[in-house]
């Protein structure tokens, strides 16, 4: 297991929410990506292929997510100060072998300007 800080901008703020970007190498074809807040699994997305190369995408923990050919984005809405924490992208690579797990993350700072509904 590889632990490290994300070497890219992991948090993208918009409209009182945040897009958390979890990248994976282009070569990875089948994987599970989990978003962890501290040690708690917030979201996950699994991409696999069957024996006829049919692709299946499944989410056990429901979050709004978006898959591209080298990243999974998880979206959190209605931000408040309780969202401030360490967030980790936990990537399990099934294909290509060998099986490998990598963990990258960063701290989500919440500033007043990023909150959804500020009191005037």
């Amino acid at each position: 297991e590889i632990n490290g800080s994300a070497n890219y901008e992991m948090f993208i703020f918009h409209n009182g929410g945040v897009q958390i970007l979890c990248k994976y190498p282009d070569i990875v074809q089948q994987f599970k990506m989990q978003l962890l807040k501290g040690g708690q699994i917030l979201c996950d997305l699994t991409k696999t292929k069957g024996s006829g190369n049919t692709v299946s995408i499944k989410s056990l923990k429901f979050c709004h997510s978006q898959l591209s050919n080298n990243s999974v984005s998880f979206f959190l809405y209605n931000l408040d100060h309780s969202h401030a924490n360490y967030y980790f992208c936990n990537l399990s690579i099934f294909d290509p072998p060998p099986f490998k797990v990598t963990l990258t993350g960063g701290y989500l700072h919440i500033y007043e300007s990023q909150l959804c509904c500020q009191l005037k």
């Epitope: 074809q29 069957g50 024996s51 006829g52 190369n53 299946s56 499944k58 294909d95 290509p96 072998p97």
Partner: antibody
């Protein structure tokens, strides 16, 4: 240790039905696509059907489409193959196989289905 | 559907000698740098056993006398030094598209 145990085979008349079961153990069943592969006596391997983790995606060989249905019960770690309108050419050993992301990495011992009058 | 063919249908090789099995697909199995081609061994009365995946990657625990090669439409399984326990039927299989299909098999015996 991964184990797949098929059951439900037997002798059936043409036009009849059978339901095969495959009990899985030793791995997280819901993490894997599962398949049925058959082998007629003295012949080669023929893929029959597969199903994704939660049963949302299903594929069949053209020769069985419309007659066979595949399903799974993840709570019971069991894969099923419902075979209707059976024909003599469906006579075979039916294997349950785990698709390990890039190959069939585990197989059951098989169950023999004989279609004959 | 992709059609898989194998040659020869059968072969007999002396113990310790090399056995070579060929597999041909009706269209290329190469995608994203990977050949979607698998080799299995099946002994009498037993289910198939995985030997090689992605055309050339040996499954864990498979003896290194088994090797796979080839790309695109032409593939080879080589047993570098045949042992008595290698007597079996060998099948290739593609998983490039649905339906996945198997070759007809090659029977390997001792000469």
């Amino acid at each position: 240790e991964v184990q797949l145990v098929e059951s439900g085979g037997g002798l059936v008349q043409p036009g009849g039905s059978l339901r095969l079961s495959c009990a899985a153990s030793g791995f997280t069943f819901s993490d894997y696509w599962m398949d049925w592969v058959r082998q007629a006596p003295g012949k080669g391997l023929v893929w029959v059907s597969n199903i994704d983790h939660d049963g949302n995606i299903i594929n069949f060989a053209p020769s069985v489409k419309g007659r066979f249905t595949i399903s799974r019960d993840n709570a019971k770690n069991t894969l099923y193959l419902q075979m209707n309108s059976l024909r003599a050419e469906d006579t075979a050993v039916y294997y349950c196989a785990r698709w390990g992301h890039y190959a069939f990495d585990s197989w059951g011992q098989g169950t023999l289905v004989t279609v004959s009058s | 559907d992709i059609v898989m063919t194998q040659s020869p249908d059968s072969l007999a090789v002396s113990l310790g000698e090399r056995a070579t099995i060929n597999c041909k697909s009706s269209q290329s199995l190469l995608s994203s740098g990977y050949n979607y081609l698998i080799w299995y061994q099946q002994k009498p009365g037993q289910p198939p056993k995985l030997l090689i995946f992605y055309a050339s990657t040996r499954e864990t625990g498979v003896p290194d006398r088994f090797s796979g090669s080839g790309s695109g439409t032409d593939f080879t399984l080589t047993i570098s030094s045949l042992q008595a326990e290698d007597v079996a039927v060998y099948y290739c299989q593609h998983h490039y598209s649905s339906p996945p299909t198997f070759g007809p098999g090659t029977k390997v015996d001792i000469k």
